[in-house]
Every structure is written in structure tokens, then in C-alpha cells.
Amino acid sequence: VPPGEDSKDVAAPHRQPLTSSERIDKQIRYILDGISALRKETCNKSNMCESSKEALAENNLNLPKMAEKDGCFQSGFNEETCLVKIITGLLEFEVYLEYLQNRFESSEEQARAVQMSTKVLIQFLQKKAKNLDAITTPDPTTNASLLTKLQAQNQWLQDMTTHLILRSFKEFLQSSLRALRQM
């Protein structure tokens, strides 16, 4: 159930509407819950989940990651720079979320929900950002060729790619939520 559509909301008509920050917080939590559900399926199917972070780091995926310069950490925190990084990162993750769409059997709907909820989250964050010009949108042609390349991998590499995308996306969202807690 997407955020804001649970029975508690229906049963409480006099509740204050969610603020922009609360809506973003709730949206990220919803996506993280979706990632947990997807990871249950991937971990049941392969032993990727037992692999160490270091072993998995030896890959060619250029997944978005928070760095000191992005202004999202406590030291050197910069609200606008950080917000731009969060939105840019989410836009970069979209191609990887598209790749995930055909990777699940029993959790097909959940994979779609994560993808659609991320699009909604990007919209929420874009409304919050003042400096939209600083946000670079990924090139569609580059994304299309990346998608083709990922889908052409052998089964083992596809399993590893799926696991890496989910884990990296989770860590990116957690870092985003930590940063948003300061805004």
C-alpha cells in the first residue's frame, strides 16, 4: 500500500495533512520496505547476500554513492548541494530500477512499486529544491545502451547486479534520509 493510503489515514479524517518533509520521509521508508521485500526473494534464490561488501565492490557498475563533497554528511553539510545530489542520484538510479523490472518472479509488483515510488519521490524533492538548474538528467541514449549491456550478462552476473543495485539503492536512501533529517 503506498504511503498515505493505509487504513489509519482513512480512520482519522481530522488528522493534520502531512508536511512536505513528512511526505518525503514516509515515501523513502515505503521504498526501503519495498527493497527489503525484493531482497528476500534475491537472497532466497542465490548466495549473493552472504558475499562481503568488499568482494561485491569489484564490479563495473557506476552506482550513485554519497561522498564528502556532496554536502550530505554532518561535516560540511550543505542543504542545497545535498538536495541536488539526492535528486541527481535518484535520477541515475532510475535506469537500474528499470533493469530490475524483469528480475523478479513472485515480487514483480513490488519491483514496479519501488520504481514508481521513486519517480514520485523525485517529484517531491524537486518541489523542495531551489536550484533545479544544477540537476543533471542522465542521457537517455547512454541509459538505453547500459540497460542492453546489463541484460546481456550471464545469469550469475545478473544475480550479482540485482543484489548490488538493491544494496546500493538502500544505502543511498538511508544516507538521504539521514541528510534530510538535518533539513
Epitope: S36, R39, K40, C43, Q74, E171
Partner: antibody, heavy 124, light 109 residues
Framework: QVQLQESGPSLVKPSQTLSLTCTVS????????VGWVRQAPGKTPEWLGG???????SYNPALKSRLSITRDTSKSQVSLSLRSVATEDTAVYYC??????????????????WGRGLLVTVSS | QAVLTQPSSVSKSLGQSVSITCSGS??????VGWYQQLPGSGLKTIIY???SRPSGVPDRFSGSKSGNTATLTISSLQAEDEADYYC???????????FGSGTRLTVLS
């Protein structure tokens, strides 16, 4: 109710591996993370590491090379393994449940319920 | 590693209120926990996620934070509150935790 219980040997020889198990009840390991903390006699507690509800581990950088945390969800158990122990690893070892919100923020050290603790002495 | 600073000891009379502070550069972006250790006993959570109280902990205990300082406040002090109190927060970058040096609370009668 929510309970965590540490078990394992109370005496370990130097250079050996310290292996402890935390058995939990009243909650599922696929809904909550579990962390390990130790406290040497008369000292401040030290966060060792944890495993979250997805099975992802995080470790204290100072101990990362010697430490391993695993889980068995079917047995509701989380295990800690500390290799090449020395006398300074003598401490009370606690397992604790990470708060529900910790999953969303990655605040795995943020714990709400503790085990009773187990004193492990490293001595020959 | 991040460093958390706490006063080493505080003393207050029975029935009074006391505030114990915890300062550190990483507190602003991380949750803060407060843990009580009675003499000869194990650790017990008094406050987690900065201001949440586990069930069974009296509402005399409250937690808050402002900037890089977190505060544990205990109102209507009782004799059984005499203990060591530790704060803990995140060590940025590895999702790990770091504990404060601890504060010994003495309740004067």
C-alpha cells in the same frame, strides 16, 4: 515479550576464536536488526558491529579484520566470531536489538532492548 | 572515530531534576541513545532514537537534541536513578556507533 540471550564459552585462550550466539524471542530477525556491544571491566561500552533485517552487516572499523557476524533466521540466532583474541578482548559481551527506525536511517547502533550480557575472559 | 563528550559526574538531590549532556560533531545527523547501567548490572536503554522511551521506562526520563548536543533529562530524581549513563550516536560513514565516556549520577538524600 522481547528477549535476547547471549551464550558461549566464558573462557577463551589467547590467539583462539571467541564465538558467541545471541538467541532472540518475541520478534523476528527479518523485521529487526541485532547488534553486538562489549564492555571491558571499568571501561565505556564499545560498539562491535551489527546485522540488519536484510542481513547486511556493519562492523567497527578497528575490529573489522577479526570480526564476523552472521545470522540464522530459522533458529532466531545471531552469531559473533572474533578471531585471534588477546587479553584486552576480555569484556562483558552484549547483544541488543536495533530500534525499528534504525533500518531506515542506517542507525544500527540505536538499540532499544539488551541481552543480559556474558562475561568472556581471555586467559591462558 | 567520532568523540562524544559527557560530564564525568553530576550530583543532585532527591526529587530535583537533572540534565546530562552529550556533545559531538556527529550528533546533528544521527540518532542518539541513552543507556543506564546500575552498579554491578548490565546496560539498559533509557532513550533510543533521540527521544523515544522503551516501554517500562518512566516518563520522568526524556531525551532531546539541539545542534551537536544531546540532552538526557531526569525529573523528580529517585534513589534508584543513581547509576552510570552513557550516550551513543553514529560514527558517520560506516553506520557504526560510538559511545560517550559516561556520566556517574549521584542522588543526594
Amino acid at each position: 515479550q522481547v528477549q535476547l540471550q547471549e551464550s558461549g564459552p566464558s573462557l577463551v585462550k589467547p590467539s583462539q576464536t571467541l564465538s558467541l550466539t545471541c538467541t532472540v524471542s518475541g520478534f523476528s530477525l527479518t523485521s529487526y536488526g541485532v547488534g553486538w556491544v562489549r564492555q571491558a571491566p571499568g571501561k565505556t561500552p564499545e560498539w562491535l558491529g551489527g546485522i540488519d533485517r536484510d542481513g547486511d552487516m556493519s562492523y567497527n572499523p578497528a575490529l573489522k579484520s577479526r570480526l564476523s557476524i552472521t545470522r540464522d533466521t530459522s533458529k532466531s540466532q545471531v552469531s559473533l566470531s572474533l578471531r585471534s583474541v588477546a587479553t584486552e578482548d576480555t569484556a562483558v559481551y552484549y547483544c541488543a536489538r536495533s530500534s525499528y527506525d534504525s533500518h531506515y536511517y542506517g542507525d544500527y547502533y540505536d538499540v532499544d532492548v539488551w541481552g543480559r550480557g556474558l562475561l568472556v575472559t581471555v586467559s591462558s | 572515530q567520532a568523540v562524544l563528550t559527557q560530564p564525568s559526574s553530576v550530583s543532585k538531590s532527591l526529587g530535583q531534576s537533572v540534565s546530562i549532556t552529550c556533545s559531538g560533531s556527529n550528533i546533528g545527523s544521527s540518532a542518539v541513545g541513552w543507556y543506564q547501567q546500575l552498579p554491578g548490572s548490565g546496560l539498559k536503554t533509557i532513550i533510543y532514537s533521540t527521544s523515544s522511551r522503551p516501554s517500562g521506562v518512566p516518563d520522568r526520563f526524556s531525551g532531546s537534541k539541539s545542534g551537536n548536543t544531546a540532552t538526557l533529562t531526569i525529573s523528580s530524581l529517585q534513589a534508584e536513578d543513581e547509576a552510570d549513563y552513557y550516550c551513543a550516536t553514529g560514527d558517520r560513514g560506516n553506520y557504526g556507533g560510538v559511545f560517550g565516556s559516561g556520566t556517574r549520577l549521584t542522588v543526594l538524600s
